[in-house]
Interface confidence: low
């Protein structure tokens, strides 16, 4: 068991919350069965443990949000994986019932008599994780507590399901929605031929589910669907790769429902296989915007188009977080790892020095440099200050006229806050409206992004478009600069004057070859011939019959 | 230093077999890119043969070498090219090359070549 | 197969001078080719790959250019050592394939 997943991030309160995140890469393959976790996480871990201390700063410093009440949290680390996960989510479980079993706080001993530490207080809720998989796994447990779970990332439709997952919410909307986005984008560009693949696990599988549903209705074929890990090895994505290379040159669009790293994983193919410039990928909110995915493998990436959720970056929390240094910050019990990985040196005298590192830290290094704030940072945000306005709702109703926690509230009774938590109602972070339906989601608004060479060996993402309640907006020039780019992904041209479809036994109905109507037969639908009845002959355009007009032969008439 | 250097070249009789060994120095072919096969006939340009792909193994022919001609890794750095049914078309100097894509990113080491001569 | 074709089998310029080099590829290869000089007794050695990219320790004077069928490699401030045959190489990812262009001799006067 590796000891870095044992380090938790402490504040103290009268209300804990407990928060998941991947302060960790997912063990590889190899290290799952001993579930040791891969390397810090800026974004999507240093990030949302910073978010989610300064959150509770902000929150606690405000007088109209939860007066007299101290909200504090304990977070640990999910490293993107669910047996990790559970393991951390079992240790939030055990301080809950300690907690339950010692009012008082005096813990009983094996032996019968009592010790004089006071225990923990319990979770009241948990934030998080990013991951749908994770999330699922980690409510199957928090549920049977009666611990609502509020997630800022986990998109999966199957989460929508209450009977299912009762304690689970979410401040962004169901994969369903991002599902119909990209099937709009692919109608957009007549596409009607292209690949699949999706991550293996919840997310991916759902998303692609849905994916491949929507697309039937919608007349698109795909030529075949593919399914990775995102911890695969290099073989499996060369393999993967070359699947995908036999569907061209038709297929040359690949929707991806991927988490980031498959989509990483297939560009690090891309490039052992010198085939940049293949496909045009089309990827989910894994991918959105993010740097590390694309970092080092932009021309495999250029062109890709995908779905970002829209969430305008907080300025801040930049203001906080860019001033971070680890001399002084030391209630993120991993920001000297962090420091130490982000800036590939060593922090000399530090308890966390990592003498793998030659190059000493020096004090002028700064966060600022390359700063990319976490695309879904709104999200976090958001998904905290749900749980403390749910908890200020629950705090007016249950102590009316009482600054601070009263009788009534303790100990906070999960199924009353779970039913304050559905009935929140805010203005979020970026001035949008957060609330939640009756399943516990979010509305669905996306961005569309666009990765383009901007200049010679730049490359960034653009915003090409978006999607906000099925209605689809982008800017066709900004895509392709002239039509005769549009990529074409079809399997088979549309069949000329007088000319049948002709589709293959086994065949996708997007596939089929074109076989002209025998002499006297008209194009009777676009898949059959029909013979013109005696006495008529098809029409100039092939669509129908016309009577041959009759002539009458005459004695003097010269042979025809 | 990686350096790649080809060997087996020589004469031999129309109808004949050959096997050319391409070994590298500083080169482990256990790693992620291709090794290849390009000749050269005489005062003449330059022609493709084969890749294989380290990572799994898999082999890329052009058309005409299909089914005369096999690429394979025999050990951790050492390539080889049969070449059967031989005839006096088949002169050539071959080149052993490797690249980080099949053709796409170009091939970026390359023996000094191994003539091979065929004639009765 | 891919047929990659190039013109002119041949040409002269002055150091200082600028040669273009052109490769048709009779399919698009979107940006799947690379470039390689070659001197007599010598392999060749790689110059550009993807269309436009400087393969390490290429001078600047080297320029790759075009996407799809239409390819062009320029070679500006003519030096005595550019003396050489140039050769393109086409690669077609859905079949897998290459093909080498038949050859460009470079004369410096």
């Known amino acids: 068991q590796s000891s870095e997943r044992r380090v938790v991030a402490h504040m103290p309160g009268d209300i804990i919350i407990g928060a998941l995140f991947s302060v960790h890469h997912q063990p590889t393959v190899d290290k799952v069965h001993e579930r040791k976790c891969g390397a810090v996480r800026e974004q999507y871990g240093i990030q949302r443990v910073e978010a989610m201390l300064h959150t509770l700063e902000r929150i606690n410093s405000d007088p109209t949000l939860l007066p007299n009440i101290t909200l504090g949290c304990e977070i640990r680390d999910s490293c993107w994986h669910s047996a990790v996960a559970l393991e951390q989510s079992i240790e939030f479980i055990r301080d809950s019932l300690i907690s339950s079993e010692e009012e008082e706080g005096l813990v009983r001993c094996v032996d019968g008599s009592s010790s004089s530490f006071r225990s923990k207080k319990p979770i009241v809720g948990v934030i998080g994780p990013g991951s749908s998989s994770v999330a699922i796994q980690v409510q199957n447990l928090l549920q049977l507590f009666n611990i609502p779970q509020i997630a800022y990332s986990a998109t999966s439709m199957d989460l929508s399901d209450k009977t299912l997952f009762k304690y689970f919410m979410r401040v962004v909307p169901s994969d369903a929605q991002q599902a119909r986005a990209m099937v709009d984008i692919v109608k957009r560009y007549n596409w009607t031929y292209v690949s699949a693949v999706h991550t293996e696990g919840n997310y991916g599988e759902s998303g692609m589910e849905a994916f491949k549903d929507m697309s039937a209705k919608e007349g698109i074929c795909i030529a075949h669907s593919y399914k990775i890990y995102s911890n695969a090895g290099e073989q499996s994505f060369d393999k993967l790769l070359k699947k995908l290379t036999s569907h061209l040159p038709k297929a040359r669009v690949v929707a991806c429902f991927c988490e980031g790293m498959t989509v990483r994983g297939l560009l690090m193919a891309m490039r052992r296989l010198g085939l940049a410039g293949e496909f045009l990928l089309l990827g989910s909110d894994g991918w959105a915007d993010r740097y590390d995915v694309t970092d080092g493998y932009q021309r495999e990436a250029v062109g890709g188009i995908t779905i970002k959720l829209q969430s305008p970056d907080v300025k801040w929390f930049d203001d906080y977080y860019l001033k971070l240094r680890p001399e002084t910050n030391h209630r993120n019990p991993w920001f000297q790892e962090f420091w130490q990985h982000r800036f590939q040196c060593r922090l000399e005298g530090f308890p966390q020095e990592n003498s793998k590192y030659n190059k000493t830290c020096n004090s002028s290094l700064t966060l600022k440099t390359h700063h990319v704030q976490d695309s879904k940072m709104g999200f976090v945000i958001n998904a905290i200050y749900s749980m403390a306005y749910g908890l200020h709702n629950m705090q007016m109703s249950l102590c009316p006229g009482y600054a601070g926690l009263c009788d009534a509230m303790k100990p906070i009774d999960g199924r009353k806050l779970l039913e304050s938590l559905m009935k929140t109602n805010f203005t979020g972070v970026s001035g949008d409206t957060i609330l939640f339906d009756e399943n516990g989601d979010s509305p669905g608004r996306y961005e569309i992004m666009n990765f383009k060479e901007m200049g010679k060996d730049y490359f960034d993402y653009i915003n090409v478009g978006s999607w906000d309640n099925g209605e689809l907006k982008m800017d066709d020039d900004e895509v392709w600069s002239k039509k005769s780019n549009i990529i074409r992904s079809v399997c088979s041209e549309p069949c000329e004057k007088g000319q049948i479809k002709v589709i293959r036994k086994g065949e996708v109905s997007c596939c089929w070859t074109c076989t002209p109507c025998k002499e006297n037969e008209y194009v009777f639908d676009e898949y059959t011939c029909k013979a013109c009845q005696l006495g008529s002959w098809p029409t100039d355009d092939l669509t129908g019959c016309d009577l041959i007009p009759v002539q009458y032969l005459r004695w003097g008439d010269p042979e025809p | 230093q990686q350096q790649l250097e080809e060997s087996g070249g020589g004469l031999v009789k129309p109808g004949g077999t050959l096997t050319l060994t391409c070994k590298g120095s500083g080169i482990d072919f256990n790693d992620y890119y291709y090794m290849c096969w390009v000749r050269q006939a005489p005062g003449k340009g330059l022609e493709w043969i084969a890749c294989i792909y380290n990572g799994d193994g898999e082999t890329y022919y052009a058309n005409w070498a299909k089914g005369r001609f096999t690429i394979s890794k025999t050990s951790s750095t050492t390539v080889t090219l049969q070449m059967t049914s031989l005839t006096a078309a088949d002169t050539a100097t071959y080149f052993c090359?490797?690249?980080?894509?099949?053709?796409?990113?170009?091939?970026?080491?390359w023996g000094p070549g191994t003539l091979v001569t065929v004639s009765s | 197969d891919i047929v990659m074709t190039q013109t002119p089998a041949s040409v002269e310029a002055a150091v200082g001078g600028t040669v273009t080099i052109k490769c048709q590829a009779s399919e698009s290869i979107y940006s799947n080719l690379a470039w390689y000089q070659q001197k007599p007794g010598q392999p060749p050695k790689l110059l550009i790959y993807?269309?436009?990219n400087l393969a390490s320790g290429v001078p600047s004077r080297f320029k790759g250019s075009g996407s799809g069928t239409e390819f062009t490699l320029t070679i500006s401030d003519l030096e005595c050592a550019d003396a050489a045959t140039y050769y393109c190489?086409?690669?077609?990812?859905?079949?897998?394939?290459?093909?080498f262009g038949g050859g460009t001799e470079v004369v410096v006067k």
């Open positions: 993807r269309a436009s």
């Open positions: 190489q086409g690669y077609y990812a859905s079949t897998v394939t290459n093909a």
């Open positions: 090359a490797r690249g980080s894509g099949v053709g796409s990113y170009g091939y970026n080491f």
